[in-house]
């Protein structure tokens, strides 16, 4: 029949929920073409009647919903003025339970997507919802380990879950859920996402280790001068920022007027496997207002603090 065959990768899907596949193969579909869907080399095209559970919607094949028996090879034939391409798509449908449905967990999942969040970054997960214009998608809800996600670090934006300052605890099993409306009927779409965390840290490129300080207090007399080192080990190729902060502000900015407390110039010693960095903080004169405040040393995503403390009175 003169059609060129193109084989797509297998799509593995979950039963009991909507699924759609768009027959696009640029640059073939960029011009004037006709698209027709078939199942298992049948000569009869997939129905275009929108009430049919399986039907063609423009260039899409739409399953409302997908059922276990829908597994098989589907072909879409793209005919242009001087060309013909037949695209083969292998769909495998199976039952998948993300949470135990017998205890009221979430229903069946579609694709087990794999996504990566980057440690220390503001990153995001995407809910992949590919449907034709005739399908209207409602707001997306996000779950982690079967519980709806809430909290300051998480923001839902369109099809994405934004995660600020990613931590190791953010790895795990996620799901995004949306209600799809088509011809007045509602269907639930639920995509499972397995999330891993890259150890490549966010604002630098590795996870530095702060050797000193160690989140402790230092006894110091009022009015004295004090210099405290922050010692950090990090990889030789790192691009991490190392600095001292107070009240979430760089000390040089916080004491911009008085310049009473300053950050020193960073130095480093190179070892075979790593570098040892030192950046100090200098208190020209310790004042009452300095006591009890955490002065934070930051190195990439790592932090450690010192707290100045008045020496205990000597009653000897």
């Amino acid at each position: 029949d003169g059609c060129k065959d193109i084989f797509m990768k297998n799509e593995i899907l979950s039963a009991s929920q909507p699924f759609a596949f768009n027959c696009t193969f640029p640059p073939i579909t960029s011009g004037e073409v006709s698209v027709t869907w078939y199942k298992n080399s049948s000569k009869i095209p997939v129905s275009k009647i929108i009430q049919s559970r399986i039907h063609q919607d423009e260039t899409w094949i739409l399953f409302l919903p997908m059922e276990w028996g829908d597994s098989g090879v589907y072909q879409c034939v793209i005919k242009g003025r001087d060309s013909c391409h037949r695209i083969h798509v292998n769909l495998t449908v199976f039952e998948k339970h993300w949470c135990d449905t017998s205890i009221g967990g979430l229903p069946n999942l579609s694709d087990e997507y794999k996504q990566i969040l980057h440690l220390g970054k503001d990153d995001s997960l995407t809910c992949h919802l590919h449907f034709p214009k005739s399908c209207v998608l409602g707001p997306i809800k996000w779950y982690k380990d079967c519980n709806e996600i809430k909290g300051e670090r998480f923001t839902v934006l369109e099809t994405r879950l934004l995660v600020s300052n990613v931590s190791a605890e953010d790895r795990g099993n996620y799901a995004c859920q949306a209600i799809l409306t088509h011809s007045g009927k509602q269907y639930e779409v639920l995509n499972g996402i397995t999330v891993s965390i890259t150890e490549r840290a966010g604002y630098g490129g590795s996870v530095p280790k702060i050797i000193y300080p160690k989140n402790h207090s230092i006894e110091v007399q009022l009015g004295t001068t004090l210099i405290v080192d922050c010692n950090v080990t990090d990889t030789k190729d790192n691009t991490n920022l190392r600095c001292w902060r107070v009240n979430n502000t760089l000390v040089d900015d916080y004491y911009d007027e008085s310049k009473r407390i300053r950050e020193g110039v960073e130095t480093h010693v190179s070892f075979r496997e790593h570098n040892l960095y030192t950046v100090n903080i200098t208190f020209l004169e310790v004042k009452m207002e300095d006591y009890g405040l955490p002065f934070m040393c930051h190195a990439g995503v790592s932090t450690a603090y010192i707290i100045l403390q008045l020496p205990a009175p000597d009653f000897r």
Epitope: T155, S164, L250
Partner: antibody, heavy 118, light 107 residues
Framework: EVMLVESGGGLVKPGGSLKLSCAAS????????MSWIRQTPEKRLEWVAT????????YYPDSVKGRFTISRDNANNTLYLQMRSLRSEDTAMYYC???????????WGQGTLVTVSA | EIKMTQSPSSLSASLGDTITITCRAS??????LTWYQQKPGNIPKLLIY???NLHTGVPPRFSGSGSGTDFTFTISSLQPEDITTYYC?????????FGGGTKLEIK
């Protein structure tokens, strides 16, 4: 619709100061990190400062560190850039931008022009 | 500081062409590369985030790829409205740095 409106730009002498403001609407301002980005007369883009959503962290390039301070007022949906000790090389169009994820500046204001000249 | 080398600085192409712009980082930036478009007299517009992810509403003729140090931005079937300037931005480590820009021109 997300809108960002910058103000506070103008002509200033070298060594002078300016405070830029950026009023945000149409978005939950407090949930997003914000940046200031400038464009030089030669059309080069330069990152100037970033502040985290909760006002906890601020970041600057060495070229402005110690001279510029980024801050925000989440109650009033406003971002600021305090610029001190201005130099001729700070002459640029200054844009504020909402950051969706790291480096992903999805919404930009129309910009405010800062000219540093004697 | 990570230096971003964007090439070419200018590029002549015909409508319907596929064009490619590259950004090379002076060190590994993982996937932390964003692409922006700026039309004359307009503000920069986000096209692609995290090297290959298309921002909402951006036509699929725009695409991005790469990780580590070498990144590619492609426009397939160039349209008249695409004839403008494009910038890359690395946000792996501070200070964040932009490429010098690529100006597209019509052949």
């Amino acid at each position: 619709e997300v809108m960002l409106v910058e103000s506070g730009g103008g002509l200033v002498k070298p060594g002078g100061s300016l405070k830029l403001s950026c009023a945000a609407s149409g978005i939950t301002f407090s949930r997003f990190a914000m940046s200031w980005i400038r464009q030089t007369p030669e059309k080069r883009l330069e990152w100037v400062a970033t502040i985290s959503s909760g006002d906890m962290y601020t970041y600057y390039p060495d070229s402005v560190k110690g001279r510029f301070t980024i801050s925000r007022d989440n109650a009033n949906n406003t971002l600021y850039l305090q610029m001190r000790s201005l130099r001729s090389e700070d002459t640029a169009m200054y844009y504020c931008a909402i950051m969706i994820t790291t480096g992903e500046h999805a919404y930009w204001g129309q910009g405010t022009l800062v000219t540093v000249s004697a | 500081e990570i230096k971003m080398t964007q090439s070419p600085s200018s590029l002549s192409a015909s409508l319907g062409d596929t064009i490619t712009i590259t950004c090379r980082a002076s060190q590994d930036i993982s996937v932390w590369l964003t692409w922006y478009q700026q039309k004359p007299g307009n503000i920069p517009k986000l096209l692609i985030y995290k090297a290959s992810n298309l921002h909402t509403g951006v036509p699929p003729r725009f695409s991005g790829s790469g990780s580590g140090t070498d990144f590619t931005f492609t426009i397939s079937s160039l349209q008249p409205e695409d004839i403008t300037t494009y910038y890359c931005l690395q946000s792996q480590s501070y200070p964040w740095t932009f490429g010098g820009g690529t100006k597209l021109e019509i052949k």
